[in-house]
Amino acid sequence: KNLKSPQKVEVDIIDDNFILRWNRSDESVGNVTFSFDYQKTGMDNWIKLSGCQNITSTKCNFSSLKLNVYEEIKLRIRAEKENTSSWYEVDSFTPFRKAQIGPPEVHLEAEDKAIVIHISPGTKDSVMWALDGLSFTYSLVIWKNSSGVEERIENIYSRHKIYKLSPETTYCLKVKAALLTSWKIGVYSPVHCIKTTVENELPPPENIEVSVQNQNYVLKWDYTYANMTFQVQWLHAFLKRNPGNHLYKWKQIPDCENVKTTQCVFPQNVFQKGIYLLRVQASDGNNTSFWSEEIKFDTEIQAFLLPPVFNIRSLSDSFHIYIGAPKQSGNTPVIQDYPLIYEIIFWENTSNAERKIIEKKTDVTVPNLKPLTVYCVKARAHTMDEKLNKSSVFSDAVCEKTKPGNTSK
């Protein structure tokens, strides 16, 4: 009886694992083995595919074959018993095009209200992704074990920290890789779960802001308790994209080591042009807080984010404020070609009660003022990019008296 050729050959490539699967054509015939040959582009001869000769099952692994993953390859298969079937040719394919990204390796660290995720490619020193290793980005799905409500986080790098979590709570997550340059989306990792720790005695510092004063940077933050010491560290932001090493060498800002106030001042020349990450930690001598959320600090934006200049038109029950571009030393306006948001603080001259208005527009109305009353106004600019979180210093306060009643028109 003539042996039939095997059918429906599937090639599965995940990272550097090359798997072939096929269907037997005739289930009734026992003790059949299967063998594959392969042919490279531009070659006439067929070569035996090592790892896939005389296979008794319907699956084989040819990962040991050292192929050029960018070169087209053709496969053929036949069944063998006493005689052999005719060859069945598989459509030619390029391994790199066909390959899927495997599940990444995931390690988790827990804090009280944060989780640190360390991600690395599932196949170390992969041949398939050798030219693309630096281009991997990752996305994850995270949920509270108790609720199952999922949150997706896209475009993260090999180390990512998720903040604002609850203490003593189990969170689960899964991660997949992507190579956006090749339009490849990978397979999810297994689910990893970790429980956040008990709440730390000392919370981390919050609301970190950098501003420029003279030739110095002024770094400020908020803290819950008094009599603390703080330290500030920096890291080049691009290092977060480096998948190679899991050690981030955060560096101390010398003037911000063991400071006893919730601010520190350091010369602008501490940092060359670039984008940095900053973080702050508190200590009371016995206990240390976890690190604050990291803020992005762009020296280019920071240096030029100057306080806004404004004019006030006074009415009886309101001020109209017109915000203009800040002036440089030569009285020329600074062109700030990124979107800004303005924070305007105003108060009655005889009171400390401040009120705040946040506006994207450059003409702002401050309503509900009393006639014939002196009000003071100061303003500052913020970048609208949440990640960069840049703020200018406040402008000098300008004080004006409202007009007598009935002049609101």
């Epitope: 720790t197 190679g244 090493n245 899991h246 981030y248 060498k249 206990n287 976890f290």
Partner: antibody
Amino acid sequence: QVQLVQSGAEVKKPGASVKVSCKASGFNIKDYYIHWVRQAPGQGLEWMGRIDPEDAETKYAPKFQGRVTMTADTSISTAYMELSRLRSDDTVVYYCARYHGYWALDYWGQGTLVTVSS
Amino acid sequence: DIQMTQSPSSLSTSVGDRVTITCKTSQNVGTNVAWYQQKPGKAPKPLIYSTSYRYSGVPSRFSGSGSGTDFTLTISSLQPEDFATYYCHQYFSYPYTFGPGTKVDIK
């Protein structure tokens, strides 16, 4: 493969200094921190400090501050730990170890016994 | 400085036994705890990092757990080569510190 090979045993007089070396191979010393840990006979492990060989930034345990100096020569992939004003209780084994972020101290040198005796 | 206590300080046990060593830190260190095994005259051998991850080549009978201030090293079925001293280590904040050690010997 990754290895840290330390210099040989030393005998020193009280008040003298000792400099222990730690030669790294199988990895780029600039990408890691090198830590120093010591152990008295029959006692536990005691952390002394660490150096970032890339820029020579150091952190020392308060107990050794002013008496220990950690340095590195990246051109020969070697870190050094010098301890001055030696006392008899500095008779211990000194270890160097590679620090790899959340992987902690993942590779250790074989140890160097320093004996302080008059 | 973060203080570390380990218990028990020593234990006598037999091959095949399940062994649990605990480590307490004086403040919350997240999961920044590692465990090392040391035999006489040898350098410490890394077993566990980041509380619960085994270094490559470490047998699966070794496991770590815990977080915050309480950590545990478990040897599920003690083997003859496991008789040694075990140290926990915090690498959350400087100065880094080690536990005093737990000596596991033959009953």
